[in-house]
């Protein structure tokens, strides 16, 4: 019996088609992805093959103005339109708190939303009961397939799930649910979830009875053969893990941003064992037409976005200096504003011993593309912020050793004076450079804001200590020559859309007046 699994993950609000790098579509003839194009391909496969499931492994929320404006209603609407069969909760589904998940998505979705390792307690338990499930048994042809969900247990550090949701260890939580499915005579089981490729592989290895793992969170691109675009495969598709009980378990993920549709064909025997598995992600490029009815719906929903772009978010009473003449040479107040917003967006008081789990921010000056003049009545709009941060990136959470941070700050000024983009703006860091010294030895003082303290203060950076840092995904991926970050990071979790982070901060503050205050000397 053959099952076709179509899957997406980490779509991050890319409802409209995008450019090849998943930023805003400029030249339509070269654009990719989007729900209208996805629907065309899904329908084509549904017509051609008998047993098809369309699954999403989480993080539909967060990433473009679509989410900023519609707050998840767009996810429910278009996933319903595409007739998704199931979705796992990702960490970003909690970005607007539990209410921001329940109202727009959980109550509106016509498909099951899953996570076995999230347990509700207190008053939330009855409110959320039945709105998401640990597993769902789906009829497919004359067979049944069990889908069990899981979500990164790091979610409390990455989003805003509140205090009434407990995120358990994935493997510990999944095993009893899979065992329950087995007692219900469900012998074909897919683990669908959002904890990253390493955890996906562990689930395949450790959870007895899981036949296939469909994952997300780490934006992993797998491919067998010659890849069709710029993404470099992390392994073959599917990636085969040998389970502790001796089975071969296929593990898949489909990169991110709706650029690909994962396509996996599984052959099951009478006992529900995987006899064979093969496939590849399908690049959703312009050779696949956009479905006209979904496209028309997108255009209808688009109108509200254009109106939103010009509405006032808040005010500035100072000039926001985002000029390259400032931000690539010295501390600039636009850099300070953005870093302050990045830290503010990551306030998570999850431990009494820590005032926050992260205190530091770094930001390449070259990523700040425009100033904002306060003489327009101080008004700041989304449109203004889009000029400052035009690349559609995210502000991510990484863990780095102190020695890596030291290298990063040396790189920041290794060719100082040439107006290059690697000059770092900071938050929660005091750095002193001596530019008379030779490159690679110019950082003379590097103090960082403590986290395990009730009164935050600056202490010297320790080379062997592991620090959490918020930074643009561009830097996490080694951009602007920061190869040491990419090579030496110990953990990387993707965060919220850059413009959204700053716009939320400005809306919260209402009036801003960031200063140049001696963070960089």
């Amino acid at each position: 019996w053959e099952l076709t699994i179509l899957h997406t993950n980490d779509v991050h609000s890319r409802l409209e088609q995008t450019s090849e790098d998943s930023s805003k579509c400029v030249n339509a003839s070269r654009c990719m992805g989007g729900v209208a194009r996805l629907f065309t391909k899904v329908q084509q496969i549904r017509r051609a093959e008998p047993n098809v499931l369309l699954l999403d492994a989480g993080d539909q929320y967060q990433g473009t103005i679509w989410f900023t404006v519609y707050k998840g209603a767009e996810v429910a609407h278009f996933m319903n339109a595409l007739r998704y069969d199931a979705m796992a909760l990702g960490n970003h589904e909690f970005d607007n708190g539990v209410e921001g998940l329940i109202e727009p998505l959980l109550k509106e979705a016509k498909f099951p939303i899953l996570s076995a390792n999230i347990k509700a307690k207190g008053p939330l338990a009855s409110q959320i009961s039945g709105l998401y499930l640990p597993y769902k048994v789906l009829p497919v042809g004359d067979e049944v397939v069990g889908i069990v969900g899981y979500t990164s247990k790091e979610t409390p550090f990455l989003s805003n799930p509140g205090t009434n949701l407990v995120f358990e260890d994935e493997i510990t939580a999944l095993q009893p649910e899979v065992d329950k499915l087995k007692t219900l005579n469900v012998n074909k089981i897919i683990a669908l979830g959002h904890s990253g490729f390493e955890m996906d592989k562990l689930i395949a290895q450790k959870v007895r009875g899981v036949d296939v793992v469909v994952g997300g969170h780490s934006n992993t691109f797998l491919y067998t053969g010659n890849p069709p675009s710029k993404e470099v495969p992390a392994g073959k598709y599917p990636f085969i893990v040998t389970s502790d009980d001796g089975r071969k378990v296929p593990v898949v993920q489909a990169y991110a941003f709706g650029k690909y549709l994962g396509y996996l064909k599984i052959e099951f025997d009478e006992r529900g064992n995987v006899i064979s598995s093969h496939g590849n992600p399908i690049l959703l490029n312009s050779s696949i037409p956009e479905d006209p009815s979904i496209k028309a719906d997108i255009n209808k929903w688009r109108i509200k976005l254009d109106n939103y772009s010009t509405q006032e978010l808040g005010k500035t009473i100072v000039y926001l200096d985002g000029s390259s003449q400032s931000c690539r040479f010295r501390e600039c107040n636009m850099g300070n504003l953005i870093c302050d917003a990045m830290i503010n967006n990551n306030l998570r008081h999850t431990d009494e011993m820590f005032w926050n789990h992260v205190s530091m921010c770094i930001l390449n000056g070259g990523g700040i593309r425009s100033p904002i003049d306060e003489r327009n009545n101080g008004t700041i709009t989304w449109e203004n912020l889009a000029a400052v941060l035009p690349f559609g990136g995210t502000f991510d959470l990484v863990q780095l050793k102190g020695s890596t941070l030291k290298k990063a700050f040396e790189h920041s000024v290794h060719r100082y004076g040439q107006s290059t983009g690697e000059f770092l703006q900071v938050g929660g860091i005091h750095v002193v450079y001596d530019l008379s010294r030779k490159p690679g030895d110019r950082v003379v003082k590097l103090d960082v804001l403590c986290t395990k303290c009730r009164v935050p203060s600056y202490d010297p950076l320790k080379m062997d200590e592991v620090y959490k840092v918020i930074l643009p995904n561009f830097l996490a991926n080694g951009g602007d020559g920061f190869q040491m970050i990419k090579d030496e990071l110990l953990r990387h979790d993707s965060g919220d859309q850059d413009i959204n982070v700053v716009s939320t901060y400005i809306s919260k503050m209402k009036v801003i007046y960031p200063a140049v205050e001696g963070r960089i000397k």
């Epitope: 025997d269 009478e270 064992n273």
Partner: antibody, heavy 113, light 106 residues
């Protein structure tokens, strides 16, 4: 639980027709095929034929003229019919799942007058 | 038809021994190979499917490997209950079996 069970006569006279039934539980014949295999005493396993989930059948070329496999999906039963039986057809006859994950216990059919 | 050549046809071994049985296909069967165990009473049980995946409840001393046309069943430490006849079965085309390997007590 996934199980298969063969049933039918233990003794068949030469030239007669053998009819064996394989009763399936734990899976659907609309999703999976059933294979038939036999093993003469002290000899090797020999594939006879298969009926696929869609209802079509394939046969070992050596038996194509006298073998028919059919099914009744609603009863979860597959029927093997072999005409013109001969003493050399004495064997244990097994039905098995399409992928060999499950086997019947086998039924010994003796062809003798 | 795809022919399967299995060797050895029989072997004598002691409890605790490592036993290896091989099967060669007349053409590439792309990992579509099972290993079966038949006990003296005639009952047939699949041990390994798709070349190397272990069936539920089968001890981990059994392992399968191979690709293309060459396939191997290994019993890492023979136990008293393992004395039986073992067959390879290819299902890339119409089923064909290897000639069997009878594992006897030395």
């Amino acid at each position: 639980e996934v199980t298969l069970k063969e049933s039918g006569p233990v003794l068949v006279k030469p030239t007669e027709t053998l009819t064996l039934t394989c009763t399936v539980s734990g899976f659907s014949l609309s999703s999976y095929g059933i294979q038939w295999v036999r093993q003469p005493p002290g000899k090797l396993l020999e594939w006879l034929g298969v009926i696929w989930s869609g209802g079509s059948a394939d046969y070992n070329a050596a038996f194509i003229s006298r073998l028919t496999i059919s099914k009744d999906t609603s009863k979860s039963q597959v029927v093997l019919t072999m005409t013109n039986m001969d003493p050399v057809d004495t064997a244990t006859y097994y039905c098995a799942g399409q992928y060999g994950s499950v086997w019947g216990q086998g039924t010994l059919v003796t062809v003798s007058s | 038809d795809i022919q399967m050549t299995q060797s050895p046809s029989s072997l004598s071994a002691s409890v605790g021994d490592r036993v290896t049985i091989t099967c060669r296909a007349s053409q590439d069967i792309g990992d579509r190979l099972n290993w079966l165990q038949q006990k003296p009473g005639g009952a047939i049980k699949r041990l390994i499917y798709a070349t190397s995946s272990l069936d539920s409840g089968v001890p981990k001393r059994f392992s399968g490997s191979g690709s293309g046309t060459e396939y191997t069943l290994t019993i890492s430490s023979l136990q008293p209950e393992d004395f039986a006849t073992y067959y390879c079965l290819q299902y890339a085309g119409s089923w064909t079996f290897g000639g069997g390997t009878k594992v006897e007590i030395k």
